[in-house]
């Protein structure tokens, strides 16, 4: 079971995680963003829930997707180059969930855009982190 | 046939101290999240506590401090540790199966908590 | 957290009629909605998930339908075994909240 320590490092992750969702969300809202009506084309699978630390398996399902779709912003949108953000959300994705590798997400009927997506998984971030224990 | 059945249920005094159980049987009772959900007297239904497979815990901030779900796998039982009890905490205690992807699929008999000095 | 609200707390209806419990979220929750029925004295019993969908053993009288922010239950053909109290939940984001229940009267 969790201890108090590793409980307090997965805050840190998922607080860690939130602030780089938040990052990549602000970079493609920009209103200097010329290709964000591109980018919005972009159809990402959402999860049919997203409650639990497992389902984050959902969200790393995604993120090739996601970075494909970073590729066609302006770079200067962002502090790190698409592939070294996915990187270290990738990372932190892969502590957070676990090693349940037997665990399949399974997605939503609808896709959504890229704002869609990642509203979806910041408040995820933002309720995980208000009622972990 | 999946069965949830709760017992520790009892009358208590405001700041005191109970724990609940729920045993289940007939399904991977480790592969699943399992929550508390209690009935108040108005018949209002609130989200106590979850704990997943992981056995990490989720709870709301009116119970978060007071309240610690856990559970035991090789027993297949399901436990909520409730002090400093407030007499807002009257109500019914049910035990549930969170299904993977959809909504508490399974709920146990209930047991009874009364806080009242 | 996300208010769930029922607005109708008691409906009254007659057995063969058509009978529609409403629910509405306060914010965006996709199809992340539960339907629970609590006949008297007993514990609630889960009628439909992912807003349209029944779980096994469940009647096809009883009809979820809905996305977003408005849920709505359908119970066609309302037989006398239907009195019961009836609760939406979302399961969209922790933590979970439930609406506050209509109680369906047989006439």
């Known amino acids: 079971a969790p201890t108090s320590s590793s409980t307090k490092k997965t805050q840190l992750q998922l607080e860690h995680l939130l602030l780089d969702l938040q990052m990549i969300l602000n970079g493609i809202n920009n209103y200097k963003n010329p290709k964000l009506t591109r980018m919005l084309t972009f159809k990402f699978y959402m999860p049919k829930k997203a409650t639990e630390l497992k389902h984050l398996q959902c969200l790393e399902e995604e993120l090739k997707p996601l970075e494909e779709v970073l590729n066609l912003a302006q770079s200067k949108n962002f502090h790190l180059r698409p592939r070294d953000l996915i990187s270290n959300i990738n990372v932190i994705v892969l502590e957070l969930k676990g090693s349940e590798t037997t665990f399949m997400c399974e997605y939503a009927d609808e896709t959504a855009t890229i704002v869609e997506f990642l509203n979806r998984w910041i408040t995820f971030c933002q309720s995980i982190i208000s009622t972990l224990t | 046939d999946v069965r949830l059945v709760e017992s520790g249920g009892g009358l208590v005094k405001p700041g005191g101290s109970l724990k609940l159980s729920c045993a289940a049987y007939?399904?991977?009772?480790?592969?699943?999240?399992l929550a508390w959900v209690r009935q108040t007297p108005e018949k209002r239904l609130e989200w106590v506590a979850a704990?997943?497979?992981?056995?990490?815990?989720y709870s709301p901030d009116t119970v978060r401090g007071r309240f610690t779900i856990s559970r035991d796998n090789a027993k297949n039982t399901l436990y909520l540790q409730m002090s400093s009890l407030k007499s807002e905490d009257t109500a019914m205690y049910y035990c549930t199966r969170d299904s993977n992807w959809d909504a508490l699929d399974y709920w146990g008999q209930g047991t009874s908590v009364i806080v009242s000095s | 957290d996300i208010v769930m609200t029922q607005s109708q707390k008691f409906m009254s209806t007659s057995v063969g009629d058509r009978v529609s419990v409403t629910c509405k979220a306060s914010?965006?929750?996709?199809?992340?909605v539960g339907w629970y029925q609590q006949k008297p004295g007993q514990s609630p019993k889960a009628l439909i998930y992912?807003?349209?969908f029944r779980y096994s053993g469940v009647p096809d009288r009883f009809t979820g339908s809905g996305s977003g922010t408005d849920f709505s239950l359908t119970i066609s053909n309302v037989k006398s075994e239907d009195l019961a109290e009836y609760f939406c939940q979302q399961y969209y984001t922790y933590p979970y909240t439930f609406g506050g229940g209509t109680k369906l009267e047989i006439k």
């Open positions: 914010q965006n929750v996709g199809t992340n």
């Open positions: 007939g399904f991977t009772f480790s592969s699943y999240t």
């Open positions: 704990i997943d497979s992981s056995s990490y815990t």
């Open positions: 992912s807003a349209s």
